[in-house]
C-alpha cells in the first residue's frame, strides 16, 4: 500500500493506477481528470480590494470606487457589523476588534462616516464632519504576538516561543521550505518552493516546533500562486497554502500579522530572518534546529548596483542582510518570513532568491509582501 501510494495514483471510474509523475503534468490521464484536480493553482491579482489598514495605528481606509480616492473611516456610528464587513472584504473570517483613535495632526486623507451596502463598506453620502474627531482602528485577527522576544545578536538557535508562526513545508516528509502562519487556514510561503512538485497530495505542513521532523504534519487542501509573468520571472514569488483543517492556536502555534499597505521600511531598519536552511553556501546540510538572525533593510539602489544584482531587484522585492555580509538566508530557508517588529510582528518579506548566501554585495532578496496584499485578500475572499 505504501509503495503504491508513493509511486502511483488511483483514478476512479474505472478504477486504475497511473504513475504519480503523471499528476499535475497538464494532461488528463484519469478519465474524469482528477489527476489534474489537486494541483498548484494560479489565481490572478484581481480587482482592488476597497478597504485597507494603515500603519498609523491600524486605521481603516475605504476606497471610493467612483473617484479612486481613499478616505479614512470616522468612528462616528461605526459598529461591530461594519467591522466584520471590513474584515470580510479582506478575506478574514475571524471576529474583529476595533476602537476609536484620535485623528492625528498629520492626517492627510479626508475623513468620512462609513455605511454598508451589498456587504461592502461605503462612504455615507450625506454625512457631516467627524464629530468624534476619531478614526477607526481595526484589527481583523489577533496576530504577531509571541511568548518570547529574541535578543539582538548575530545568528543563534531559535525557540518556537519566539516564532510561533514558523512552519516547515515538506514534500514526502523532506523539509523543502519555510512558511508563516497567517490565520487558522492559511500559510504564506514562496511560489518557487512548488516548481518541482505541483501535486498537492504529498505536501505537508509542520507547525509548533523548532526542531525539524519532531511535530505532526498537517494536510494541505490547496496551494495557490500568482500567474507567472515572463517579463519579470523572479517577481510574484509568493504562494498561499490552505490547510485541510484549521489550526488551533496555542503558545507555539500562532499567526504573524500581514504588513500594512503603507509599510515602507527605510534602509537600516532592523529585521529578523529564521529558518532550517543550509548553514553553509553550496554545502553542509539543513539545520535540525531553527536558526534566527538579525539583519537590516538594504537600500534597493545599492542592491541593484553593478557589483550586486544589476537591476534585477524590482519594486515588488526588497533586500535585507548586513552591510559586511555573513548573515543571510540560504537554501531551505525559502518561503520563510522576513520579519519587522512594531507593536506586533509583521511578515514584510518572503525568502525568495539571491546569489550565494551571505555575500557582502549580494544580500538576500525577498518578496515584498505589501505589494501582494490585494492578491492575498482576493484569494482569501474567494475561499471564504
Amino acid at each position: 500500500k505504501v509503495i503504491l501510494d508513493k509511486y502511483y495514483f488511483l483514478c476512479g471510474q474505472p478504477l486504475h493506477f497511473i504513475p504519480r509523475k503523471q499528476l499535475c503534468d497538464g494532461e488528463l490521464d484519469c478519465p474524469l481528470g482528477e489527476d489534474e484536480e489537486h494541483c498548484v493553482k494560479s489565481f490572478p491579482e484581481g480587482p482592488a480590494v476597497a478597504v485597507r489598514l494603515s500603519k498609523d495605528r491600524s486605521t481603516l481606509q475605504v476606497l471610493d470606487s467612483a473617484t479612486g480616492n481613499w478616505f479614512s473611516a470616522c468612528f462616528d456610528n461605526f459598529t461591530e457589523a461594519l467591522a466584520e464587513t471590513a474584515c470580510r472584504q479582506m478575506g478574514y473570517s475571524s471576529k474583529p476588534t476595533f476602537r476609536a483613535v484620535e485623528i492625528g495632526p498629520d492626517q492627510d486623507l479626508d475623513v468620512v462616516e462609513i455605511t454598508e451596502n451589498s456587504q461592502e463598506l461605503r462612504m455615507r453620502n450625506s454625512s457631516g464632519p467627524c464629530l468624534s474627531g476619531s478614526l477607526v482602528s481595526l484589527h481583523c485577527l489577533a496576530c504577531g504576538k509571541s511568548l518570547k522576544t529574541p535578543r539582538v545578536v548575530g545568528v543563534e538557535e531559535a525557540s518556537v516561543d519566539s516564532w510561533p508562526w514558523q512552519v516547515s513545508i515538506q514534500y514526502d516528509k523532506q523539509h523543502v521550505c519555510g512558511g508563516s502562519i497567517l490565520d487558522p487556514h492559511w500559510v504564506l510561503t514562496a511560489a518557487h518552493c512548488f516548481r518541482k512538485h505541483t501535486d498537492v497530495f504529498n505536501w505537508k505542513v509542520r507547525a509548533g516546533s523548532d526542531k525539524l521532523g519532531s511535530f505532526p504534519s498537517l494536510a494541505v487542501a490547496k496551494i495557490i500562486i500568482i500567474e507567472f509573468n515572463p517579463m519579470y520571472p523572479k517577481d510574484n514569488d509568493i504562494a498561499l497554502m490552505k490547510l485541510q483543517f484549521p489550526l488551533t492556536f496555542s503558545g507555539t502555534v500562532r499567526p504573524i500579522c500581514l504588513p500594512f499597505f503603507d509599510e515602507e521600511l527605510t534602509p537600516a531598519t532592523p529585521l529578523w530572518i529564521i529558518g532550517w536552511g543550509f548553514t553553509k553556501q553550496n554545502g553542509g546540510k539543513m539545520s535540525d534546529i531553527l536558526l534566527q538572525a538579525s539583519v537590516q533593510v538594504i537600500d534597493s539602489t545599492r542592491c541593484n548596483a553593478d557589483d550586486a544584482y544589476q537591476g534585477e531587484v524590482t519594486e515588488k522585492m526588497m533586500c535585507a542582510g548586513i552591510p559586511e555580509g555573513g548573515v543571510d538566508t540560504c537554501q531551505g530557508d525559502s518561503g520563510g518570513p522576513l520579519m519587522y517588529q512594531s507593536d506586533q510582528w509583521h511578515v514584510v518579506g518572503i525568502v525568495s532568491w539571491g546569489y550565494g548566501c551571505g555575500g557582502p554585495s549580494t544580500p538576500g532578496v525577498y518578496t515584498k509582501v505589501s505589494a501582494y496584499l490585494n492578491w492575498i485578500y482576493n484569494v482569501w475572499k474567494a475561499e471564504l
Epitope: P105, D110, V111, V112, S127, P129, L131, G133
Partner: antibody, heavy 120, light 107 residues
C-alpha cells in the same frame, strides 16, 4: 475649485450689529467645519469660533461668547457670522476659513475678508 | 489658553537667503502646529501643518520642524514672492491661538 466668497465692507455705529456672509462652493459644504478669524488693522490673527454646517452646532472663543452668533443656510451653502454690541475695537477684517472634517484641523481655504469699520 | 510667541517679530533678508522663524508654545502641543503666509491686503494661506507636513501646492523651499513647545519655519532660498508676514497657529486645544506674526522684509 474651492471658493469662499464673503460679503462686502460694512460701516457700523457703536452698539449696532453686523452680519457677514460667506458663500462656499467647489466642495461638499456640510462635511467640513467653518471657522471665523478676525484681524484688527496692523494686528495679528484672532480666532473667533467654529460652526458645523451639517448640524448647525457652534463653538465660540470665550472673548466673544454672548456677542457672536454663527448660523448657516444649507440651501445656499452659506455661513453667517453676526457680531452684536459693536465697539470701536471690533474694527477689523473678518475672515471665514474652511477647516477639515475634524475640529483640530488647519484652515486650508480662506475667504477674501470683509472689512467692518465701527465708528461713530 | 495656550500662548504662541514668534521670534523675531520682523526681519530683513535678501533674495536667496535662508530664513528661519521660530514659534514657541506656552505648553506642549505635540505637532499640532500650522504655519500661514499672509501678504498685505490678502487672506492668509496655509503653508505647513502637523509642524512639518507641506500643504499641497506649496513650494518645497518651505519646511517646518519641531515638536512639543519649539517650532521652526525655514525658507531655504528666499524668493521675491516670499516677502510677507508669517503666522504660527496651535491646533492642540481650543481656543485656537496664533502667534503675533513675523514680517519678512526686503533688505
Amino acid at each position: 475649485q474651492v471658493q469662499l466668497v464673503q460679503s462686502g465692507a460694512e460701516v457700523k455705529k457703536p452698539g449696532a450689529s453686523v452680519k457677514v456672509s460667506c458663500k462656499a462652493s467647489g466642495y461638499t459644504f456640510s462635511r467640513y467645519y467653518m471657522h471665523w478669524v478676525r484681524q484688527a488693522p496692523g494686528q495679528g490673527l484672532e480666532w473667533m469660533g467654529w460652526m458645523n454646517p451639517n448640524s448647525g452646532d457652534t463653538g465660540y472663543a470665550q472673548k466673544f461668547q454672548g456677542r457672536v452668533t454663527m448660523t448657516r443656510d444649507t440651501s445656499t451653502s452659506t455661513v453667517y457670522m453676526e457680531l452684536s454690541s459693536l465697539r470701536s475695537e471690533d474694527t477689523a477684517v473678518y475672515y471665514c476659513a474652511k477647516g477639515r472634517e475634524w475640529l483640530r484641523s488647519p484652515f486650508d481655504y480662506w475667504g477674501q475678508g470683509t472689512l467692518v469699520t465701527v465708528s461713530s | 489658553d495656550i500662548q504662541m510667541t514668534q521670534s523675531p517679530s520682523s526681519l530683513s533678508a535678501s533674495v536667496g537667503d535662508r530664513v528661519t522663524i521660530t514659534c514657541r508654545a506656552s505648553q506642549s502641543i505635540s505637532t499640532w502646529l500650522a504655519w500661514y503666509q499672509q501678504k498685505p491686503g490678502k487672506a492668509p494661506k496655509l503653508l505647513i501643518y502637523a509642524a512639518s507636513s507641506l500643504q499641497s501646492g506649496v513650494p518645497s523651499r518651505f519646511s517646518g520642524s519641531g515638536s512639543g513647545t519649539d517650532f521652526t519655519l525655514t525658507i531655504s532660498s528666499l524668493q521675491p514672492e516670499d516677502f510677507a508676514t508669517y503666522y504660527c497657529q496651535q491646533l492642540s486645544s481650543y481656543p485656537l491661538t496664533f502667534g503675533q506674526g513675523t514680517k519678512v522684509e526686503i533688505k
